[in-house]
Each structure stands twice: as C-alpha cells, then as structure tokens.
Interface confidence: medium
C-alpha cells in the first residue's frame, strides 16, 4: 500500500484557500488564481494554481502530517503548465521540514528539497535539483533541460534509500544516477599525491626542431619588391614631382619565415598524469537521501510573466503509485489541450486574416470614395442604359 | 439598390438543426462580409459571426462557437447560417447585415434582411 | 449580459434634445474609433445611425451626432420627434480579436 503524503488536484473549487497559506513576509507578493487557463483538456479537473500578477514574487505553502524518508523512496510530482510563454521565472517546489512558519516563508527560508523547472531567457531552461545537505544548498552538477512550451508538463524526483536518484519528465527518465557522483555533498574520495611532483627531466613535448634541418641559402627573400613593369609616366616633373619611385607588390619568392621541420621526439614520454591517493577527508555517507522531516510543500518563485499554472502535487513513497498518477492526469489530459490550443491557434490566424482583409477593403473603399469626390456627378445609370443614351465616361 | 432577402419564419423541436438563407442583390456579392446577428425576444442584439463570400472563411462568436456554421455560395450570392443542437434560448430572430451599402466602413452594418424568426419548441 | 452598458431607456419631450451613453472598456470603445448606433424599430430591421463614432450615414437627419470620451460613446438626438421612438443599440467592433459587441440597448420613449 503506497503511503500518500500529499496529494492536491484542486478539485473542491474554492477550498484551496483553507489549505494553503500565502506568506505576510512580504505585502506585495504576487496572488495566486485558482484556473484551468486559456486552454485545457478538462475545464474542471485542469484547474490548478495560476500566478496572477507580473513581475512579482509568489510565495504560497500548503502543510501536511510530518514524515521522514528515511529507509523508504521519496517522490515529489506535479504538473507545470508555463501558458503564458514564460519568459522569465521559476516552475520548482521547496519541500521544507514542518517547523517552518508558513506565514513568514520567503526566499531565504531553509527547506530540504527545492525541484522543478527554471527559465530565464534564452540562457537558463533548466530543472533544479538542490538538496540541503548539512546546512548547505547544493545543486545538481548535470544541466536537466526543461520544457518551455505552453503545455502542461509533469515533472517527478525519485529519490531512493541506496542513494540513486531519477528525474522525469512526461513520466519519460531525463536523467538519474548517484546522489554521491552527481553532487558535490562529499569531499572526493581521491585527491592528486600533494608529495607526488612532475620529474625535472620529464619531456612532455610529442614534436621537436628536427637538428639536421638547416634553411636553404636562397630562402631569405624580401616580402614585397617593386613592381617590375611599372613605368614612370611621360609627365613626370622630377623637380615638380621628386624622384619617381615605382610601386611596390607582393614578392612572389617571398617564403615568409624559416621553421624546421618537426620530427618525433625521441625522449617523449607523455603527459605526466598527477598520481591520486585516498583523500584521508574522505568518509562515505549513506544516509545522503535521508531528512527527518518534511512538512511543507512551497512555491516560492519570481515570475516577470505571470500565468504559470501549478496541479497535480504528489507527494509518495510509491513509484510506480507516482506514475499511474501522472498518467491519470496529466497523461488524460495532454491531446485534449494540445487539441483545444490548436483550434484557438487556427481561430486566431483566421482573425489576423480577416483584420488584414477588413483594413484592405477600408482602403479601397477610401479610395473609391475619393474617386466618387474627384469625379464629376453623372447620372446613375447602368452601362447598358449610359450606352444607348450615348453617354460616354469623360 | 442594394437588398438582403432572408427565408421565412422556422418551427424546430430541441436537439433540431434550423439552416436559414440571406439572398444578396445590387452588389458584388464577394465584395464584403455578411455577418449574423440574434435577437432574442426581450432581449438586445449579439453578433453570431461572419463569413467573407471570397473564401469562406468564418468566425464565430464565442457563446455560438461550435454549433453555428456560417457558409456562402457565390453562384447564388445567398449566405447561410445553420444553428444545431437547438434550445429554447435559441429562439429569436436572426438577421443578415453587410456594409455593402455606398458610404460606411466595413466595421458598420448598414444593410440588414428582414428578419427570420425561428422558434425552438417540443 | 452584454458587453457593452447602456441605461435601460431614456425619454424626451418633442423638440428637447436626448443623449444615449454606452460605456464599455479600453479594449472595444475605449481603445478603438469603430463605435456604431443603430435604430430599431419594433417588427423591422434595424438601421444604422452613426458609424466610426460621429459619421452619419446619407439619409441619417443630421440632429443624429455621435461623440466619444474615454471608454463611453454618446448617441445625442436634438429636436426629437414622434418617429425616433425606438429601441437604440450601440455596437463595437474589436479589431484585436474581430468581433463585433453589442450594449444591451435602450429604449427611447417621446413624450407626449
């Protein structure tokens, strides 16, 4: 039986707001909206929390019974949805312990676990993984992309008891490996020799000057003489003009600078490759994985464009719980909204070509009405009447 | 002169789809726009939608998105609005309009039909 | 509701002058010169009055003006008669999205 932490799909309207907690940390962070957005696959089972307001700071937290992950699997999902073609601004969780004071969370607050999508121009699209280790923030040293589309995306960390991790993303892996390889929690555990140093009479050089090589006599040559068929033009004044001198061109036997050749260097013994030790500062930790205490799921973001939309948080110990999950929401609802953003994106090239077909017709009817000013009045007749009249266009 | 003739008046049952008709003379029928507006009895004018005879092309107001279909046939210069899944709401009259008329800007109706009332009843 | 506010009726006396607001936002009347009046009269169709704010159509008697401030347009009618007894309908159309809204309409009575 999967032990469900937490679990938020906001599907009981308006009674978001007696679970979360928005911060007083600061007065002017950003509200957060409950919707399903200008798109989606199910109006009411796509409703999640929206940022609101440009340019703000959002910090908003929601607590749950406290639990360690010690000895078990630690899963953290939810789905992100960045509709507003995000242009700068953070999609991530903070999982904090439960002596956090939710009232006062803010950005500088200490929490366990802070993932998800980050995105700032074209430079920074990127998933956060930090841990807190020991006081300290540590980030993943691998680059995880993120997506940055308008569609809704399910981001999952897998943290397991042997120290593996996993990061999906649309329940496809991204990336996974060691806690220990993929950050820098430990000292290594192999440092260079400090009493090892590179032997004086060790050659590195894989090429030398070849000693019998010598430059040919007739090398040195200038590199621009003058112009052989150039001749002095028949006006030329000397008093006037000088003395005439011919212009200069390239040598074509200029050679440019002599260089031996280069031949294998007999003592070459390669590059000299540090010798490592065991790092006596070195000692395993097992328990990397393990916090005592989770509590509170957070989301404390800066967002230049607001419209970012947040569902579908899963806190387990269950993996295959998290992606069955996944699959049953974000999974139902994907084709829908890609469906439903495709027929709006269609409504509005139809627009943008009508509004362009509107302004035309505005033009030529303007200029039908200057001609009708310009021109003198006329009875309005049809072509076949004017005709047998004998009426004939000016 | 200018003239916008509808179809007459329509009886339809709920779940019905009622298709009305808009005859255009005394303009290039390709010329302009024909829109549809509603009025419901009691109630104010609201825009249905467009369609230019050029091409075909529609747009749809968004509370008729989805079960109003706007066509026109230019080898009849006649314009078309059908209305599916009817409901008793639906019951109103419908009008054509176009700024085919001398003087005003294509963002103006100044020609209307006459009128089609269509009434949605079991 | 209609996207577009006008006050349920107004009245006059022959002779007396009326004006008709229609407040909407700076994404229709506000933000755009496309604001139309049309008259219409019980059982016909209705018949545009004023187009692109203050233009009149030929044929429109010119006691019909149209005037704009912010995002309310005005319909006034001066020297009221009989026959403008009728329900008035201003209208915008929304280039950013091209569509057409209507106000809800008011119902002019002449007195007397």
């Known amino acids: 039986e999967p032990a469900v932490y937490f679990k938020e799909q906001f599907l009981d309207g308006d009674g978001w707001t007696s679970r979360w907690i928005e911060s007083k940390h600061k007065s002017d962070f950003g509200k957060f909206v409950l919707s399903s957005g200008k798109f989606y696959g199910d109006e009411e089972k796509d409703k999640g929390l929206q940022t609101s307001q440009d340019a703000r700071f959002y910090a908003l937290s929601a607590s749950f019974e406290p639990f360690s992950n010690k000895g078990q699997t630690l899963v953290v999902q939810f789905t992100v949805k960045h509709e507003q073609n995000i242009d700068c601004g953070g999609g991530y969780v903070k999982l904090f312990p439960n002596s956090l004071d939710q009232t006062d969370m803010h950005g500088d607050s200490e929490y366990n676990i802070m993932f998800g999508p980050d995105i700032c121009g074209p430079g920074t699209k990127k998933v956060h993984v930090i841990f807190n280790y020991k006081g300290k923030n540590v980030l993943i040293n691998k680059d995880i992309r993120c997506k940055d589309d308008e569609f809704t995306h399910l981001y999952t960390l897998i943290v397991r008891p042997d120290n593996t991790y996993e990061v999906k993303i649309d329940n496809s892996q991204v990336e996974s490996g060691s806690l220990e390889d993929d950050w820098d929690f430990l000292p290594p555990k192999k440092i260079k020799d400090p009493d090892a140093s590179k032997p004086e009479d060790w050659d590195e050089r894989a090429k030398i000057d070849d000693p019998t090589d010598s430059k040919p006599e007739d090398w040195d040559k200038p590199e621009h003489i003058p112009d052989p068929d150039a001749k002095k033009p028949e006006d030329w004044d000397e008093e006037m003009d000088g003395e005439w001198e011919p212009p200069v061109i390239q040598n074509p036997e200029y050679k440019g600078e002599w260089k031996p050749r280069q031949i294998d260097n007999p003592d070459y013994k390669g590059t000299w490759i540090h010798p490592e030790i065991d790092n006596p500062e070195y000692s395993p930790d097992p328990s990397i994985y393990a916090y005592d205490n989770f509590g509170v799921l957070g989301l404390d973001l800066w967002q230049v464009k607001s419209g970012t939309i947040f569902d579908n948080f899963l806190i387990t110990n269950d993996e295959a719980y998290a992606e069955e999950f996944g699959n049953e929401t974000w999974g139902v609802t994907k084709a829908a909204e890609k469906q439903m953003k495709d027929k709006q994106d269609e409504e509005q090239r139809t627009r943008r070509m009508m509004r362009t077909k509107m302004r035309m017709r505005r033009m030529r009817r303007t200029r039908r009405k200057m001609r009708r000013k310009m021109s003198p009045a006329r009875p309005r007749t049809s072509c076949r009447e004017a005709c047998l009249q004998g009426w004939t266009e000016a | 002169q200018v003239q916008l003739v509808q179809s007459g008046a329509e009886v339809k049952k709920p779940g019905a789809t009622v298709k009305i008709s808009c005859k255009v003379s005394g303009y290039s029928f390709t010329d302009y726009f024909i829109h549809w507006v509603q009025q419901a009895p009691g109630k104010g004018l609201a825009w249905v939608g467009l369609v230019d005879p050029e091409d075909g092309e529609t747009i749809y107001a968004e509370k008729f998105q989805g079960r109003v279909t706007i066509t026109a046939d230019t080898s009849t210069d006649t314009a078309y609005m059908e209305l599916s899944s009817l409901r008793s709401e639906d019951t109103a009259v419908y009008y054509c309009?176009?700024?085919?008329?001398?003087?005003?800007?294509?963002?103006?109706?100044?020609?209307w039909g006459q009128g089609t009332m269509v009434t949605v009843s079991s | 509701q209609s996207a577009l506010t006008q006050p349920a009726s107004v009245s006059g006396s022959p002779g007396q002058s009326v004006t008709i607001s229609c407040t909407g936002t700076?994404?229709?009347?506000?933000?755009?010169?496309?604001v139309s009046w049309y008259q219409h009269h019980p059982g016909k169709a209705p018949k545009l009055m004023i187009y692109?704010?203050?233009k009149r159509p030929s044929g429109v008697p010119d006691r019909f003006s149209g005037s704009k401030s912010g995002n309310t347009a005005s319909l006034t009618i001066s020297g009221l008669q009989a026959e403008d007894e009728a329900d008035y309908y201003c209208?915008?159309?929304?280039?950013?999205?091209?569509?057409?809204?209507f106000g809800g309409g008011t119902k002019l009575t002449v007195l007397g």
């Open positions: 700076s994404s229709d009347v506000g933000g755009y010169n496309y």
């Open positions: 209208s915008s159309y929304i280039p950013s999205s091209t569509r057409w809204v």
């Open positions: 692109d704010v203050n």
């Open positions: 309009a176009t700024p085919g008329g001398i003087l005003t800007d294509p963002d103006a109706f100044d020609i």
